[in-house]
């Protein structure tokens, strides 16, 4: 006889998360970002794939493009021309790097309900976009830029020198895409479509990374990418502007580079149009502690662009690199000359400043021991921005409005008290003139997207509240999460701890540290996630901790720039310090502590394992950097300087994983990498493996053939299954 199972308690009807739940994306959430097309209208793709236009003020909606039309060309994306006469439909999406992809484009004429025939676009196209007004098209095909006055017209070829892997027009090369622009495009229409600015990248002299792509053929293919590693020759960049009405008149006109920038190696960092005849360019010295913002004006008489020295604004860091991860971009005010920009104040916190004439005379708009993170919109009377000021939690994001029409300017937190427990991490999307805006809350509760009136901040409607997800989670035993801080030697270490559902402080639990730790990153954020570590806590009873140490962002320059020219030291120290503090808390089994990380996190986890502290039993490094000499120049040199004797070669050599091969002898190490990683090359793990073999140190490894830095698709399932087995074995947990 067996006693009957009791089902009356809620605890008993609930189940733990499974690995299958995570791999199937069972508990993924949705967000709603309106595709704004005016002050009060937006487009959205409905559940049945119709493209619907919503008018907030009339409350009406209508389908502008049916799912039937979308399906007829297998479209996965669309773009409405600003004059609402045409829609481009994107199909045959083929991913290249992080942002870049090629696609086939069809133009649909809304006035007659037919696809535009004659002068069809070539395929595949690398980038295509409408002008901001009307229906001009700019596109990049085979590294050259073309212009169409209207979709049915023949194209005007703007550039002729484009060449695969050599000259890139209107699109970035690998390093600019990944490390500088963070976009797939490098062309920018002026506000009314009069001019088109574009970048030309010359990669002729850049060394090439080559790796095998195995595919299914008898012989593997070799992938060649011009990829400047630290200290190598960089791309040569030039910026041109062409008049799109009279493109052949004087042709593309080059925008001059500020003399103080042009005197040595430099980067172009961003372009911002101010008016149709005023443009703002940002440049950066190769040693990335000096940035110059240059405002240029069109000279009608000469048909050239003039960038007077009086309109050059210098931003310099004396304690680290310029900016945060990137140098911030300006948001211009209505006078078309003054602007708002985020940079470090005298106390070393990133804040909004108003620049009217010189940077020295900048007026500080926000201040405090917290940071302004993003300026969303500046209108005639308001400035909307996000910060982590509220309740002094650096891992939160709230949206604020500052009235700039009145004096003194008044500040209001738009989001702080909306759904206080559920929502502490917001972003926003504004319609024209900030007439309306959408708020997207990422957590810590279930994400929710709402629509608001731009004048009153009143909530108009819920756009997406993830009801299905809420219902699905009702019978799931989710782990508990807490965000707290440790004060150690004048350093504040914020951490997030993920605890098993029935956590009991009197018991001992295995601890897994998940680390990223890269410069200007933040792992401890008040966001919702049901992921692999949620499963490890829920089902496998592990405690997982994420720690933001020195080098991480949004807590001031002292913490951020602490790692300048010294990568691989303090990030590791701070993870170790945190682990020691966690052990002191009394519920960690100090014989079962592991660390894992991906990319920069793989580098940190490897160094932590090889720190010789004896704290870690095992660890995993996925796609780690192993030597900074192997990584991209733009990223690496920002934080490390150059690998030359008279600069920082010594620390480049001291900070490798290979130099610590001997120290892996007393830990279980799992090394994982994709063979087609275009970002952190397989070379990094190959060198770790070689060093470990040469030191006769045993370790485990897994490669993923033809997979890039993201290890996507079926590899993801294999990866997390494999890592789960490894951790359970390390922690002596039964399978």
């Amino acid at each position: 006889l067996r006693p009957s199972r009791v089902h009356n308690s809620e605890e008993n009807t609930m189940r733990a998360l499974t690995l299958k739940d995570i791999l199937n994306g069972t508990f993924s959430y949705k967000t709603f970002f309106p595709n704004w097309i005016s002050g009060q209208e937006y487009l959205h793709q409905s559940a049945d794939n119709n493209i619907v236009l919503y008018n907030i003020e009339t409350g009406q909606s209508y389908t502008i493009l049916s799912n039937r039309t979308m399906k007829s060309v297998n479209a996965s994306n669309y773009g409405l021309s600003p004059d609402r006469q045409f829609v481009y439909l994107e199909s045959d999406y083929s991913k290249l790097w992080r942002y870049s992809y090629t696609a086939t484009y069809y133009i649909y004429d809304l006035s007659n309900g037919e696809f535009v025939r004659g002068n069809e676009l070539p395929r595949p196209i690398q980038y295509l976009c409408w002008s901001p007004v009307g229906s001009k098209l700019a596109y990049v095909y085979q590294n050259n830029i073309y212009l169409k006055q209207r979709p049915g017209d023949p194209p005007f070829q703007i550039t002729f020198n484009g060449r695969e892997n050599k000259i890139f027009n209107g699109i970035p090369d690998w390093v600019y895409e990944e490390e500088m622009l963070a976009t797939k495009y490098a062309l920018w229409w002026s506000p009314n479509g009069k001019f088109l600015a574009y970048a030309e990248f010359n990669d002729t002299d850049i060394p090439v990374i080559a790796y095998s792509y195995y595919g299914d053929e008898q012989y593997p293919r070799t992938i060649n990418i011009p990829y400047p590693k630290a200290g190598a020759k960089n791309p040569v960049v030039r910026i041109f502007i062409i008049d799109t009405t009279y493109p052949a008149y004087v042709g593309p006109q080059e925008v001059p580079v500020p003399a103080m920038i042009a005197s040595s190696d430099y980067y172009f960092s961003w372009l911002t149009w101010v008016t149709d005849e005023r443009v703002c360019l940002q440049w950066l010295k190769r040693v990335q502690n000096v940035s110059v913002l240059s405002i240029c004006d069109f000279r009608e008489d000469w048909q050239t662009w003039d960038c007077p020295k009086t309109q050059e604004h210098i931003e310099e860091s004396r304690t680290g690199w310029a900016g945060g991860f990137f140098v911030s971009t300006p948001v211009f005010s209505y006078d078309a000359i003054s602007y708002y920009k985020i940079f470090s104040d005298k106390d070393g916190y990133k804040h909004i400043h108003y620049i009217k004439d010189t940077v020295e005379n900048a007026i500080q708009i926000t201040s405090g021991k917290w940071e302004a993170i993003n300026i969303f919109r500046v209108t005639q009377d308001s400035l909307f921005y996000s910060s982590n000021e509220f309740e002094e939690y650096p891992g939160r994001r709230n949206i604020y409005r500052i009235s700039i029409g009145s004096y003194p300017p008044s500040k209001k937190c738009v989001t702080c008290h909306l759904r206080k427990e559920r929502c502490q991490y917001y972003t926003a999307s504004f319609s024209d003139y900030a007439k309306y805006y959408a708020l997207v809350c990422y957590g810590p509760g279930i994400p929710i997207s709402t629509l608001h009136d731009g004048r009153t901040d009143q909530e108009i409607k819920i756009l997406e509240e993830n009801k299905e997800l809420e219902n699905a989670l009702k019978n799931i035993q989710l782990p508990k999460e807490e965000i707290k801080k440790l004060e150690v030697d004048e350093i504040t270490l914020w951490y997030k701890m993920i605890l098993p559902p029935q956590f009991d402080r009197s018991k001992k639990y295995p601890l897994l540290i998940q680390v990223y730790g890269g410069p200007c990153s933040q792992s401890v954020r008040s966001v919702f996630a049901v992921n692999w570590i949620s499963y490890l806590a829920s089902k496998e009873g592990m405690v997982i901790a994420l720690v933001d140490g020195r080098g991480t962002a949004f807590q001031g320059d002292k913490l951020l720039y602490a790692v300048y020219r010294k990568l691989g030291v303090y990030e590791v120290e701070d993870q170790i310090t945190a682990v020691r503090k966690f052990i002191e808390m009394g519920f960690i089994d100090e014989k079962r502590i592991a660390i894992w990380g991906w990319s920069y996190g793989g580098y940190v986890s490897s160094l932590a394992l090889a720190s010789g502290t004896g704290l870690f039993k095992c660890g995993i490094a996925v796609a780690p950097v192993s030597s900074w000499e192997y990584y991209a120049s733009v990223y690496t040199e920002r934080f490390m300087g150059l690998p030359t004797k008279d600069d920082n070669l010594e620390h480049y050599k001291n900070s490798t994983v290979m130099a610590r091969a001997e120290y892996f002898r007393n830990v279980d190490y799992l090394l994982i990498h994709g063979t087609a990683d275009d970002n952190v090359h397989f070379q990094n793990s190959a060198q770790i493996a070689k060093a470990l073999v040469n030191a006769q140190v045993d370790f485990q490894a897994m490669w993923y053939s033809d997979q890039n830095h993201g290890l996507s698709g079926l590899s993801t399932n294999h990866l997390y299954t494999h890592m789960t087995h490894f951790l359970k074995q390390c922690f002596s947990l039964s399978d």
Partner: antibody
Framework: EVQLVESGGGLVQPGGSLRLSCAAS????????MSWVRQAPGKGLEWVSW????????GYADSVKGRFTISRDNSKNTLYLQMNSLRAEDTAVYYC???????????WGQGTLVTVSS | DIQMTQSPSSLSASVGDRVTITCRAS??????LNWYQQKPGKAPKLLIY???SLQSGVPSRFSGSGSGTDFTLTISSLQPEDFATYYC?????????FGQGTKVEIK
């Protein structure tokens, strides 16, 4: 389909004036540079004038500068050429043409004959 | 102004012949060169734009090449309807100029 129809040609005495019109249809007239090209009897083609999409920018051949004025009315989809101080050498068929990108003439009207003779 | 010189000024050819007309600019015009066909009493018709791009609806026997100062129009196999006058044209600095024309006649 794109159509350009010229009108206003005829016989005029030297020193006289004439106004040519060109009615455009089948395309978004306000978005394009428009132009006049002429062809004297038995001769080749000669560009006369062009006007930008908004009408604020114009160009003229040296042979007509100061005598001819190009204009447009985007609300009426019509292009004009005001010809003053006409000379015998202005005798030609005048074509209205769309000057795409300010570079090539992709659509032409059928032409209107202007004869300057006493 | 940029001068455009066409050669020959006239030519006689038979149906099926390969015909080549050249055009020289007095200074470099990059690829901004266009070709037109004109039949008696009719308006000119665009054949080739930007030196080598075939205008929509124009038969593929017409092709263009060249850049800088020297350009060529080729008719790979002359058809009866191709007997006409051909003009080259450039538009650098928004000052369009035409060649003097090449008359293609039946041999």
């Amino acid at each position: 389909e794109v159509q350009l129809v010229e009108s206003g040609g005829g016989l005029v005495q030297p020193g006289g004036s004439l106004r040519l019109s060109c009615a455009a249809s089948g395309f978004t007239f306000r978005g394009y540079i428009m132009s006049w090209v002429r062809q004297a009897p038995g001769k080749g083609l000669e560009w006369v004038s062009w006007i930008g999409p908004e009408g604020s920018r114009t160009g003229y051949a040296d042979s007509v500068k100061g005598r001819f004025t190009i204009s447009r009315d985007n609300s009426k989809n019509t292009l004009y050429l005001q010809m003053n101080s006409l000379r015998a050498e202005d005798t030609a068929v005048y074509y209205c043409a769309r000057l795409l990108y300010g570079t090539w003439f992709d659509y032409w009207g059928q032409g209107t004959l202007v004869t300057v003779s006493s | 102004d940029i001068q455009m010189t066409q050669s020959p000024s006239s030519l006689s050819a038979s149906v099926g012949d390969r015909v080549t007309i050249t055009c020289r600019a007095s200074q470099s015009i990059s690829s901004y060169l266009n070709w037109y066909q004109q039949k008696p009493g009719k308006a000119p018709k665009l054949l080739i734009y930007a030196a080598s791009s075939l205008q929509s609806g124009v038969p593929s026997r017409f092709s263009g090449s060249g850049s800088g100062t020297d350009f060529t129009l080729t008719i790979s196999s002359l058809q009866p309807e191709d007997f006409a006058t051909y003009y080259c044209q450039q538009a650098r600095l928004l000052l369009p100029t035409f060649g003097q024309g090449t008359k293609v006649e039946i041999k």
